[in-house]
């Protein structure tokens, strides 16, 4: 097989037709030395999954539901390009399953027993396999037969589809569940009318059925949404309150030496030529021979699915769930409003080392997984690996957009006993520099720079922003001669001056030896110019405070604060001289954890936090010699956030501007996915 | 620095048992936390049991019911009763006392046990 050839899957005779012509006509329009289509012929879907993962194939087209077959080992394939729907300007590639009331009710999703429920038909997703996977463990047992089990869970339900002679409660509500439209509450719009009639008290349809149906906002208005944490929503907040996000059409590949860039380069190709209203002697998105053959004949397109986007987080954690729970059977022995032990994500083995020291004084209410990156244990938290880690306000900000919730905010300046219950202004982040030198923030240009890692808010979103507003432009790699920024580009002169050692050098973890604040300022000590780090990081590595050799001797006079109007202060000035204030680190978790995560903290600290006062024969949560592991060392206590409860309400709407507008530059492949 | 040993490793047949000794060079007395962790072939090193000061224990699931950790203070020696052992059991078993645990990666020799018929 040439290597520039993608061997696309069909499954019926009439897909092969539809292949043949596609290869035809992409061989009429590419070059000869472009991409080229072959095809494969299976007999079904999962045969086409089987077959890529056999290295038979190399693409094709898959449900939601499929997608999560070809993500299963042995087959790991990945999403490489979505079919969008709607506009090109508005490109729609998921839906969302939602749970529609009316807004005179009072329940919420964990009161749906005994309800009347409205569903668009037996195995559809956002109707049955959904809503019926997140309700798997409340349902009552035996679980099997499941149409038995939901029949007992609601009070009546209108299933189409469903068998109504087994199972007559499931077409209570429509008798004899009509498999069509000529059931009335049959499909999305049917079962909203369902809903809209007062058959049923929920309809499990999709975000887009409500608008469909009803043109009138004083109509929607009298409709909400059921959200998973047991609150409600407006229907327009879907995005906020859905039980699950669906994709809507993918197309996979092997995730090692799966072609990517090579389906990419075809279908872009293919898009440009024989899209919607390209041309007339082949469509893309129709065909004479069937409906929706190799793609949906409702697609407008296609998008590239970001690489660091894997079936995992392009499925989501609740869709998972849901299949999961539907397919294997099986739940927690524990009841589910009781809260199992908490799994913090913990970076490489310095942290993985004082988290197993958490997890034994904890009694296992604590247990450890560990990623190589704050990013990969941000991925690890949204897909469930995980439930909860403390982050810089920089990765506060990429968790949030990620879908993680903030919990509580480290306290770094409030005594006991009210520091829980106390909500910080932050701290100040600062430009360091050696009282010798004679730089100032104006001449900082062709300098030796010390970064505590990329995407973090001293080190990186606040200088660099400031700078990019003096500079326009987003090679920050050219203003710096060289640097060591952990996360960069290996062959960026901001791993220049990084320490390693070797495999981990410039890697945003413990492992480099100049990440962190305490890593930068050792870099600035050892070979920097500027040290963009906080404002306590000079008082908390001088004078003796951190006995590592390098810093045992160093004093706090010998150096010097940066000031935006180009003086320079004493590190002991930082409320008049900084860059900006940066809002405090914050444990952050996925929202269906966050309540669990919050009690089970403020119970640990009340043992382990800062009124422990011999770390030497006890373990401290935070305490770990200036390397700040799992939590910044200076932390005083967990505080409550109150109502800054999401990362835009904790971050501030300045700083979150700030990064925005850095996005520009953004080098983050975790934030690229969760932006899709 | 406490220097930790470990001894008392070896071959056993599926269902037998082992008892492995982390003797310490110094006083354990005041340390917070010991541990066992083993490393398989191939595998990261993973945490087996752990004791706090005051002697509560913390095990994986894997080894809960199986394995039990102790620690003798006077005697300043961590211990680890292994029961029932399976073949998944095999591994490199080390222990720690986690006071060097925020400067370097220091693990001793390590003691094996292999678990065949």
């Known amino acids: 097989v040439p290597e520039k050839s993608v061997r696309w899957c069909a499954v019926s005779e009439h897909e092969a037709t539809k292949c043949q012509s596609f290869r035809d006509h992409m061989k009429s329009v590419l070059p000869s030395n472009g991409p080229s289509v072959a095809c494969v012929k299976k007999a079904s879907h999962l045969d086409c999954i089987r077959a890529i993962a056999a290295n038979e194939a190399d693409a094709v087209t898959l449900d939601a539901g499929l997608v999560y077959d070809a993500y299963l080992a042995p087959n790991n394939l990945k999403p490489v390009v979505a079919e969008f729907y709607g506009s090109k300007e508005d490109p729609q590639t998921f839906y969302y399953a939602v749970a529609v009331v009316k807004k005179d009710s009072d329940f919420q999703m964990n009161q749906l027993r005994g309800r009347k429920s409205c569903h668009t038909g037996l195995g559809r997703s956002a109707g049955w396999n959904i809503p019926i996977g997140l309700l798997y463990c409340d349902l009552p047992e035996p679980r099997k037969p499941l149409e038995k089990a939901v029949a007992n869970f609601f009070s009546g339900s209108c299933v189409p589809c469903a068998d109504g002679t087994d199972f007559p409660q499931l077409c209570q509500l429509c008798p004899g569940c009509g498999c069509s439209t000529l059931n009335q509450y049959f499909s999305y719009s049917g079962a909203f009318k369902c809903l809209k009639d007062g058959a049923g008290d929920v309809a499990f349809v999709k975000h887009s059925t409500i608008f469909e149906n009803l043109a009138n906002k004083a109509d929607r208005d009298q409709y909400e949404l059921l959200c998973l944490d047991n609150t409600r929503k407006s229907v327009d907040e879907y995005k906020d309150c859905h039980l699950a996000r669906v994709p809507s059409h993918t197309v996979v590949a092997r995730s090692v030496g799966g072609k990517e860039d090579l389906i990419w380069e075809l279908l872009n190709q293919a898009q440009e030529h024989f899209g919607k209203d390209k041309s007339k002697e082949f469509q893309l998105f129709s065909s004479p021979h069937g409906k929706d053959l190799l793609f949906k004949d409702s697609a407008h397109g296609f998008l590239k699915v970001p690489p660091r986007m894997d079936a995992k987080m392009y499925l989501g954690y609740e869709y998972i769930t849901a299949i999961r729970n539907l397919r294997e059977g099986t739940c927690p022995e524990a009841p589910t409003d009781e809260c199992k032990p908490v799994k913090w994500c913990a970076l490489s083995h310095h942290e993985r080392l004082k988290c197993d020291e958490w997890s034994v004084n904890s009694a296992g209410k604590i247990e450890c997984e560990s990623a190589e990156t704050t990013e990969d244990c941000i991925a690890k938290i949204m897909n469930g690996e995980a439930d909860a880690m403390s982050l810089d306000g920089g990765f506060v900000y990429i968790a949030g957009m990620c879908g993680l919730v903030p919990v509580l905010a480290e306290n770094y300046n409030t005594p006991n006993p009210n520091c829980e219950n106390t909500a910080e202004e932050g701290y100040f982040a600062v430009a360091v520099v050696k009282s010798s030198s004679d730089l100032t923030w104006d001449n900082l240009k062709g300098k030796k720079s010390c970064h505590t890692a990329v995407g973090r808010t001293a080190g990186w979103n606040i200088p660099m922003g400031l700078l990019y507003s003096k500079i326009n432009h987003c090679r920050f790699d050219e203003f710096f001669s060289e640097g060591c920024a952990p996360g960069s580009e290996k062959n960026s002169s901001l791993c220049k001056l990084c320490m390693g050692p070797s495999p981990n050098l410039c890697e945003p973890n413990n492992k480099e030896g100049y990440y962190g604040y305490t890593g930068a300022f050792r870099c600035l000590v050892e070979k920097g110019d500027v040290a963009f780090v906080k404002h306590q990081t000079v008082p908390q590595n001088t004078g003796g405070k951190n006995p590592d050799a390098w810093a045992k001797n160093l004093k706090e006079e010998d150096y010097e604060l940066l000031c935006l109007d180009g003086s320079r202060k004493s590190v002991q000035e930082p409320a008049n001289c900084h860059l900006a204030r940066a809002p405090n680190h914050a444990v952050v978790a996925r929202k269906d954890k966050a309540d669990c995560v919050q009690t089970l903290l403020l119970d640990q600290q009340r043992m382990f936090g800062s009124s422990v006062t011999d770390c030497s024969s006890n373990f401290c949560l935070f305490e770990s010699k200036t390397k700040d592991l799992l939590f910044r060392d200076d932390t005083v206590c967990l505080a409550k956030l109150h109502d800054r409860n999401t990362y835009e309400k904790y971050l501030g709407e300045e700083y979150v501007k700030a990064v925005t507008n850095l996005r520009k530059c953004s080098t983050s492949p975790l934030l690229e996915a969760c932006t899709f | 620095e406490v220097q930790l040993v470990e001894c008392g490793g070896g071959l056993v047949q599926p269902g037998g048992s082992l008892r492995l000794s982390c003797a310490a060079s110094?006083?354990?007395?005041?340390?917070?936390?010991m541990a066992w962790y083993r490393q398989a072939p191939g595998k990261q090193r993973e945490l087996v049991a752990g004791?706090?000061?005051?002697?509560?224990?913390n095990y994986r699931d894997s080894v809960k019911g199986r394995f039990t950790i102790s620690r003798d203070n006077a005697k300043n020696t961590m211990y680890l009763q292994m029961n029932s052992l399976k073949p998944e059991d095999t591994a490199v078993y080390y222990c720690?006392?986690?006071?060097?645990?925020?400067?370097?990666?220091?693990w001793g020799q390590g003691t094996q046990v292999t678990v065949s018929s």
């Open positions: 110094g006083s354990i007395f005041s340390i917070a936390t």
């Open positions: 004791i706090t000061r005051s002697g509560s224990t």
């Open positions: 720690t006392d986690y006071s060097s645990r925020y400067y370097h990666d220091y």
